[in-house]
């Protein structure tokens, strides 16, 4: 299964309106929204409509789109109105190869890394923004601290944990704290005057299809925090995995296609075939996420121009015992990071 659908050009001929030059109004003010937001199919983002009014299921590749029914911004889709001249009222969601991203009204080019603020580093890959926190103490001090508080320190970007019961702190807890920190997914090792740190990979930015996952690491010559990114594909969007769940079972933890295929990315094809495993689905309220995985390097060959390689998430096994929060909110897992709102807003 391809990492990314091969970009296609689709044409759409809208039904003629009485007045072909009149643009219909798709937004109504004041906003009129249903009481509860819609439930979107797996992998389809739940987003605010183009009128900035209601939650809608984002239009997908090939779907009709309007100023209200907007295309999925997390999938690098844009509304192509070229088939609706001269009104430009109804378009078709299309994929731009190497599409850039827009965050807070600022456009970023494909592959560009940027800091929306001092707390986060983000990367744009094919319309998807993946961010990692630069403040490396997302957890309160453990073991000895009974009353931790997260406070802003004047002149410093990152908030610090302070402990109101500092006076009762037992001695020699630094070693314990370090162990607790190391067990939490951070990789620590001391070399020269640098404490090496590698954050865990962020969750994949999409629940199906091609997404991005990022992490920060200072394991480099300068001991400087740098962002690494890898492509991820938790499950294909075009396969109904529920159909593969065995009789009597509630989950299919891992879905693996029968045939090995090439990965494709922006029109380029992997130099060898792969038979990847994908995370499956459950019929109850559980979600399947990668449990045992590694990062592999995939070489791509392009029809014109040089090839390139990309780091790609390779799933070995998935864990299906987490309750699903909102499977359509691709940034839901970022909420566990402090100041998530600062990325989202």
């Amino acid at each position: 299964t391809a990492l990314s659908p091969t970009p296609t050009t689709m044409t759409f001929t809208p039904a003629p309106l009485e007045e072909t030059t009149t643009r219909p109004e798709f937004c109504k003010w004041p906003c009129e929204c249903p009481q509860s937001p819609p439930r979107c199919p797996l992998g389809v983002s739940l987003i605010t409509d183009g009128c900035e009014c209601c939650k809608i299921c984002a239009q997908q590749l090939g779907d009709n789109c309007t100023e209200a029914a907007i295309c999925d911004p997390h999938r690098g889709l844009y509304c192509d109105y070229s088939g609706d001249r001269p009104r430009y009222a109804i378009g078709v969601c299309a994929q731009v190869v190497g599409v850039g991203c827009v965050l807070d009204g600022v456009r970023y080019t494909n592959g560009e890394s940027f800091q929306p603020n001092c707390r986060y580093n983000c990367t744009c890959i094919d319309g998807t923004v993946g961010c990692t926190p630069l403040c490396l103490s997302p957890r309160p001090p453990r073991l000895w601290c009974r009353q931790p508080r997260h406070v802003r320190v004047p002149g410093q970007c990152c908030e610090q944990w302070v402990c109101d019961d500092d006076a009762r702190r037992p001695r020699q807890t630094a070693l314990l704290d370090t162990r607790a920190f190391a067990a939490s997914g951070a990789v620590e090792q001391r070399y020269e005057n640098c404490i090496a740190y590698t954050s865990p990979w962020s969750p994949c930015s999409t629940t199906c299809g091609l997404g991005i996952s990022t992490r920060i690491s200072n394991v480099n010559a300068r001991c400087w925090p740098e962002q690494e990114s890898r492509l991820c594909n938790l499950r294909p969007c075009d396969v109904d995995i529920q159909l593969h769940i065995k009789a009597g079972k509630k989950c299919l933890a891992v879905y693996q296609p029968e045939e090995a295929t090439n990965f494709t990315l922006a029109g380029c094809v992997s130099t060898r075939t792969y038979r990847p495993k994908y995370c499956g689905v459950c019929t109850d309220n559980r979600c399947c996420i990668p449990y045992k995985s590694k990062t592999i390097s995939v070489d791509f060959q392009c029809p014109e121009g040089p090839g390139f390689s990309r780091q790609v998430l390779w799933i070995n096994a998935c864990f299906c015992n987490l309750s699903c929060r909102n499977p359509n909110d691709i940034f839901a897992d970022l909420e566990s990071y402090p100041d998530f709102e600062e990325i989202a807003n």
């Epitope: 989950c251 933890a253 045992k292 590694k294």
Partner: antibody
Framework: EVQLVQSGAEVKKPGASVKVSCKVS????????MHWVRQAPGKGLEWMGG????????IYAQKFQGRVTMTEDTSTDTAYMELSSLRSEDTAVYYC??????????????WGQGTLVTVSS | QSALTQPPSASGTPGQRVTIACSGS????????VNWYQQLPGTAPKLLIY???QRPSGVPDRFSGSKSGTSASLAITGLQAEDEADYYC???????????FGSGTKLTVL
């Protein structure tokens, strides 16, 4: 090639807990599903539990539910099996054995050398 | 009481063909694959047959497995002295939601 090396023999009193370790080399734990099997003296093999790739969670034999905990430390590629509230009938050789995710079928191969746990007052 | 039943013992002379049966039910062998393990005296078990009839590399072709309905069997042709060991079948049991081993068969080469 995967190799599993287990911790040494243990003697425990009834009611105590034992924690057996299993160190992986040749592969990393992220590529393996670890299972634990025990064998009482002169008796057959008894599966205790392990990560089931099909169900996507660690499953335990009903007999050991609530008494056994299986954990992993991926930074050291070491798996652990802790059995609590020990009784004399828990005296056995405890084996770790792996299922490799590369395989299309569930098969336990290879196995650790075994750890003898003796429960005696 | 094992979910899979095996005869406690089997025997044969060198060069002979021996089969070991493994009987289960629709909740295990009937709907899942069977593996066979060999345990030589004083050693850890070793995978002998997986997926009913597949041999891992390094296992001689004298060993073969088969499955029919809710039963499986292991056949050893051209029996050799070094085949003297305990043999266990293993499958997944849906009703128990776990993996199960047979009671084991002690093979003696006379």
């Amino acid at each position: 090639e995967v190799q599993l090396v287990q911790s040494g023999a243990e003697v425990k009193k009834p009611g105590a807990s034992v924690k057996v370790s299993c160190k992986v080399s040749g592969y990393t734990l992220t590529e393996l599903s670890m299972h634990w099997v025990r064998q009482a003296p002169g008796k057959g093999l008894e599966w205790m539990g392990g990560f089931d790739p099909e169900d996507g969670e660690t499953i335990y034999a009903q007999k050991f539910q609530g008494r056994v905990t299986m954990t992993e430390d991926t930074s050291t590629d070491t798996a652990y099996m802790e059995l609590s509230s020990l009784r004399s009938e828990d005296t056995a050789v405890y084996y770790c054995a792996t299922f490799m995710f590369d395989h299309d079928w569930f098969q336990l191969d290879p196995w650790g050398q075994g750890t003898l746990v003796t429960v005696s007052s | 009481q094992s979910a899979l039943t095996q005869p406690p013992s089997a025997s044969g002379t060198p060069g002979q063909r021996v089969t070991i049966a493994c009987s289960g039910s629709s909740s295990n062998i009937g709907t899942n694959t069977v593996n066979w393990y060999q345990q030589l005296p004083g050693t850890a078990p070793k995978l002998l047959i997986y997926n009913n009839n597949q041999r891992p590399s390094g296992v001689p072709d004298r060993f073969s497995g088969s499955k029919s309905g809710t039963s499986a069997s292991l056949a050893i042709t051209g029996l050799q002295a070094e085949d003297e060991a305990d043999y266990y079948c293993q499958s997944y049991d849906r009703s128990l939601s776990g993996y199960v081993f047979g009671s084991g068969t002690k093979l003696t080469v006379l």
